[in-house]
């Protein structure tokens, strides 16, 4: 139930967060599950624990395995598992599928590529970006905070993009790379005030307690490529990242689709292991572009199990 997959490359930094949550004041102990050996907290070690984070500085193939984190609350010890796989660096340029993060889509006027997992690291701008192993050069490419912006996107811009940054730990620098695919939707057109196709305004979505639930925020912004169009979810008027509930996550990046020639974006909100308290929250699907912002509110209700009669 409390398990998470993480992966990295040998000789790079890898930082993993405990899947079990807790207050910042709680002690977290880490163990290598196969041997039950405690992970040290002293930073002089190559692999060490730092609260909810497990740090491989740098990682080695032999580090692969399952790590146990135990969050020591005032009452119980709560256990989580991190399944870590460290791969050898490829000699050629191809990035294998098992090292790829989720694919993102863009268009001529909307082309952000976020660098995966970067929030776990102590890094400073700018990021370095590569496409198919070649360093990106030219004024069309702008590294901004934790993402890459490509101006005047063309179909030729599709490909595998790698972000590279330096993690700093007590004055020592470690390289980190992460790769994801970028696809391009190319079409000329016009833009409109956002139209939210789903969810309906004030929609009530039935969910089952204990099960997973997905909410899709889908909006169209006109025809063809769109400039500064976005959809996102808010919880009780707060950004998902600021809300602080790890079970509720937005799908990283935005999927772009073209419905009847219209340029549409969707963002999936994933709620793992729905809890009763999730029904108390207000879920806002926001769609915005240069014309303005439109908001549709959704609430969750408990689905009553259907009686089956023979």
């Amino acid at each position: 139930k409390f398990s998470k997959q993480s992966w990295g490359l040998e000789n790079e930094a890898l930082i993993v967060r405990c899947p079990r949550q807790g207050k910042p004041s709680y002690t977290v102990d880490w163990y290598y599950s196969q041997t039950n050996k405690s992970i040290p907290t002293q930073e002089r070690n190559r692999v060490f624990a730092s609260g909810q984070l497990l740090k491989f500085l740098p990682a080695a193939v032999a580090d692969s395995g399952i790590y146990t984190c135990i969050v020591r609350s005032p009452t119980f010890n709560r256990t989580g598992y991190a399944n870590v796989t460290i791969y050898k660096k490829q000699s050629d340029c191809n990035v294998p599928d098992y090292l790829m993060y989720s694919t993102v889509s863009g268009s001529e006027k909307n082309s952000k590529i976020y660098c995966p997992t970067i929030d776990l690291y102590n890094w400073t701008a700018p990021l370095e970006w590569f496409k198919n192993c070649q360093a990106l050069q030219g004024s069309r490419y702008r590294a901004h905070k934790s993402f890459l912006v490509i101006d005047n996107v063309m179909t030729e811009d599709a490909g595998d993009y790698t972000c590279k940054f330096i993690h700093n730990e007590n004055g020592a620098n470690y390289s980190v790379t992460a790769t994801r695919s970028f696809t391009v939707k190319d079409e000329q057109g016009f833009s409109l005030f956002p139209v939210i196709g789903a969810p309906a305004q004030n929609e009530i979505k039935e969910v089952e307690i204990g099960k997973n639930a997905n909410l899709t925020c889908s909006a169209c912004f006109g025809k063809g490529t769109q400039f500064l169009a976005a959809v996102l979810w808010q919880l009780n008027g707060t950004k998902i990242t600021d809300f602080g509930e790890p079970r509720i996550q937005q799908e990283e990046g935005q999927n772009q689709s073209f419905s009847n020639g219209l340029a549409c974006l969707d963002m999936v909100l994933r709620i793992a292991d729905v809890k009763e308290e999730d029904l108390l929250l207000q879920y806002d699907c926001l769609a915005l572009n240069l014309h303005g912002l439109r908001r549709h509110t959704v609430r969750l209700s408990r689905k009553n199990p259907i009686d089956h009669h023979s």
Epitope: Q21, G22, K23, F76, I209, E245, E277
Partner: antibody, heavy 121, light 106 residues
Framework: QVQLVQSGAEVKKPGASVKVSCKAS????????LHWVRQAPGQGLEWMGT????????VYNQKFKARVTMTADKSTSTAYMELSSLRSEDTAVYYC??????????????WGQGTLVTVSS | EIVMTQSPATLSLSPGERATLSCSVS?????MHWYQQKPGQAPRRLIY???KLASGIPARFSGSGSGTDYTLTISSLEPEDAAVYYC?????????FGGGTKVEIK
């Protein structure tokens, strides 16, 4: 919605035992630690202990350790608190309660209606 | 165990007045939770993690503090705020509550 429904009032003689039940609904029973808090008439709140229904592990307030037993039945989503060797000062309302988000220990957000246990000869 | 001392024991104020309830702790804690209890009812969570307002609680309630001194403030008393208020620590086991402050509305 989250509900914690407790068993009815009990009258016991000194030296006897009492077993109070707390039936949970509206959430996944094994995902949340259940706590027991008591309140003597006109007095404040006193934490007795907690149980993790998933594992059956318990943590008791030292004051009650020798006399209290907390159990959980996953099949019926019911927690139990048994207090033995009752004395008159155990006369109180006994509550079961749980946090809002378990891992954050963010206060007792849900409470049972309370069970009055009267100890009298 | 951590001993929680609430003051004053009783607070008698008029509607619209500001109520300040204190909770002093015998040793430092990271967070404080506050509850409201009316006669014949189970306690109700008001404030959690020192300053966060629980769901459905009016904004006139607020919490603050750190270390060994914490405060619950009711900015403008309403008649329905008459109740006993308890602070509670979840820093170390056993979890402990304050003795309560009774708020009376004149």
């Amino acid at each position: 919605q989250v509900q914690l429904v407790q068993s009815g009032a009990e009258v016991k003689k000194p030296g006897a035992s009492v077993k109070v039940s707390c039936k949970a609904s509206g959430y996944t029973f094994t995902d949340y630690e259940l706590h027991w808090v008591r309140q003597a008439p006109g007095q404040g709140l006193e934490w007795m202990g907690t149980i993790d229904p998933e594992t059956g592990d318990t943590v008791y307030n030292q004051k009650f350790k020798a006399r209290v037993t907390m159990t959980a039945d996953k099949s019926t989503s019911t927690a139990y608190m048994e207090l033995s060797s009752l004395r008159s000062e155990d006369t109180a309302v006994y509550y079961c309660t749980r946090a809002f988000y378990n891992d954050y220990d963010d206060g007792f957000a849900y409470w049972g209606q309370g069970t009055l246990v009267t100890v009298s000869s | 165990e951590i001993v929680m001392t609430q003051s004053p024991a009783t607070l008698s104020l008029s509607p619209g007045e500001r109520a300040t309830l204190s909770c002093s702790v015998s040793s430092s804690v990271s967070y404080m939770h506050w509850y409201q209890q009316k006669p014949g009812q189970a306690p109700r969570r008001l404030i959690y993690d020192t300053s966060k307002l629980a769901s459905g609680i009016p904004a006139r309630f607020s919490g603050s503090g750190s270390g060994t001194d914490y405060t619950l403030t009711i900015s403008s008393l309403e008649p329905e705020d008459a109740a006993v208020y308890y602070c509670q620590q979840w820093n170390t086991s056993p979890l402990t509550f304050g003795g309560g402050t009774k708020v009376e509305i004149k």
